[in-house]
Interface confidence: low
């Protein structure tokens, strides 16, 4: 197997879409698989076409974290396997901006994924660090939820409430609209009581370097950094 066109590395903004191309040839026509950070690609769309002994594979991704994407072309001559690899990195420009920047506005939640969790007509904080805050934050919830994959029935509603209230934070309107973070106690209850096993899995992933923890914290809060309801009951939101 021989790679004719290797995927290209990209430096993109958070919430962008990227299409990675990989073209290979060989006799017989090779198969192409994509690897993300050492594992099979868990999300994204793969399209393939074969013409004149050339296979073209396109992986389209919604970028919420940096990663190393490897295209592996394999074919088999008799008992012998032939493999070719090519890799590309996806890095995120200004990836920490949404964390640091509190610029945004209050608006009624009009999305779908958090409909059952957020109060009807809830005022949420939309972060103007994103080009399209509603769409970006909505997709961020989806992506974060995919990270949880298989969760227990006990964890699911608690995690859903935590994610939705963290990404679509309650908004305090005023001259400077302000997001109201979740109270530390509620975050800890989800982490240590309802979703202890699941949380461990996510932290394990972070330690293994599968994604930068700062990026990861955009979707799952770091409980210790949240305000306590005992300090100021109005400074944080209760789930």
């Amino acid at each position: 197997a021989r790679i004719l066109r290797a995927p290209e590395s990209h430096n993109v903004t958070f919430g962008s879409f990227v299409t990675l191309h990989c073209t290979a040839t060989g006799i017989p026509v090779p198969t192409i698989t994509w690897i993300e950070n050492g594992n099979a690609v868990s999300s994204g769309s793969i399209q393939e076409s074969v013409k004149d002994r050339v296979i073209d594979s396109r992986l389209q991704l919604f970028i919420t974290k940096p990663g190393l994407y490897t295209c592996i072309a394999t074919n088999k001559h008799g008992e012998k396997f032939s493999t070719a690899k090519a890799a590309a990195t996806i890095s995120i420009a200004e990836w920490s901006k949404p964390q640091k920047d509190n610029k945004g506005y209050c608006a009624q939640y009009r999305g779908e994924v958090c409909n059952a969790v957020l109060a009807k007509d809830a005022l949420v904080f939309l972060n103007t660090s994103y080009a399209d805050p509603e769409e970006a934050q909505e997709l961020l919830v989806h992506t974060a939820w995919n990270e949880l994959k298989v969760v227990s029935p006990v964890c699911r509603p608690a995690a859903e409430a935590l994610l939705c209230n963290h990404i679509f934070q309650e908004c305090s309107p005023g001259v400077v609209p302000t997001p109201i973070p979740i109270c530390r106690e509620y975050c800890l209850a989800v982490k240590e009581l309802f979703c202890a096993k699941e949380w461990l899995v996510m932290e394990e992933k972070t330690h293994r370097g599968l994604y930068r923890s700062e990026m990861h914290l955009l979707s799952v809060p770091e409980c210790s950094k949240l305000p306590s309801m005992h300090w100021d009951p109005t400074a944080c939101a209760r789930l």
Partner: antibody
């Protein structure tokens, strides 16, 4: 060969709802995202929204409050409902297949289009 | 919303000549761009996706190029059946189309 066919009333009264159905043949409706796109006479194309059979959907923000999409997998059909229509909703309505899987893509198969006129 | 701007609005070309159509995005869309051809009374037909990949069954005289915000569709040798309206469409965020370029016989 994938084929899409739109059907529905050609005339709708203002303030009422426009309802269209798209019948897909030559492909399983469960395998792709499916979109609705419209084109007012002599003008450009406007994407209305799309859905996947699992219930995941995305809508054009400017139309979102008025749009509902549904699917009948047993008939390999999907539908569009646009409420509170005005004369500005008069257009040729197309159904189309989204060529990519999970994320937005290009539209590789289209229906022939059906003209909907909003008039009293 | 990502706004797509096409130019020129009308392009007058003689059969056998080369036609170059431009499309500009209001922000970077990487290579998430498609081109369509539409003839009167017909649905659009996909020509190019991912900015430069020809769709199935599209003749080699159609080619696409560009990335980021500037894109070009080139028809190397115009045939009589190529006179139509051409639209670009981005799919980096929710899909939006350009206003179209009409390619007419000179």
């Amino acid at each position: 060969q994938v084929q899409l066919q739109e059907s529905g009333p050609g005339l709708v009264k203002p303030s009422e709802s426009l309802s269209l159905t798209c019948t897909v043949s030559g492909d399983s409706i469960s395998s792709y995202y499916w979109s609705w796109i419209r084109q007012p006479a002599g003008k450009g194309l406007e994407w209305i929204g799309r859905f996947y059979t699992s219930g995941r959907s995305n809508y054009n923000p400017s139309l979102k409050s008025r749009v509902t999409m549904a699917v009948d997998t047993s008939k390999n059909q999907f539908s569009l409902k646009l409420s509170s229509v005005t004369a500005a909703d008069t257009a040729v309505y197309y159904c189309a297949r989204d060529g990519f899987g999970s994320y937005f893509g290009s539209f590789d198969y289209w229906g022939q289009g059906t003209l909907v006129t909003v008039s009293s | 919303e990502i706004v797509m701007t096409q130019s020129p609005a009308t392009l007058s070309v003689s059969p056998g000549e080369r036609a170059t159509l431009s499309c500009r995005a209001s922000q970077s869309i990487i290579s998430n761009l498609a081109w369509y051809q539409q003839k009167p009374g017909q649905a659009p037909r996909l020509l190019i996706y991912d900015a430069s990949t020809r769709a199935a069954g599209i003749p080699a005289r159609f080619s696409g190029s560009g990335s980021g915000t500037e894109f070009t569709l080139t028809i190397s040798t115009l045939q009589s059946e190529d006179f139509a309206v051409y639209y670009c469409q981005q799919y980096n965020k929710w899909p939006t189309f350009g206003g179209g370029t009409k390619v007419e016989i000179k």
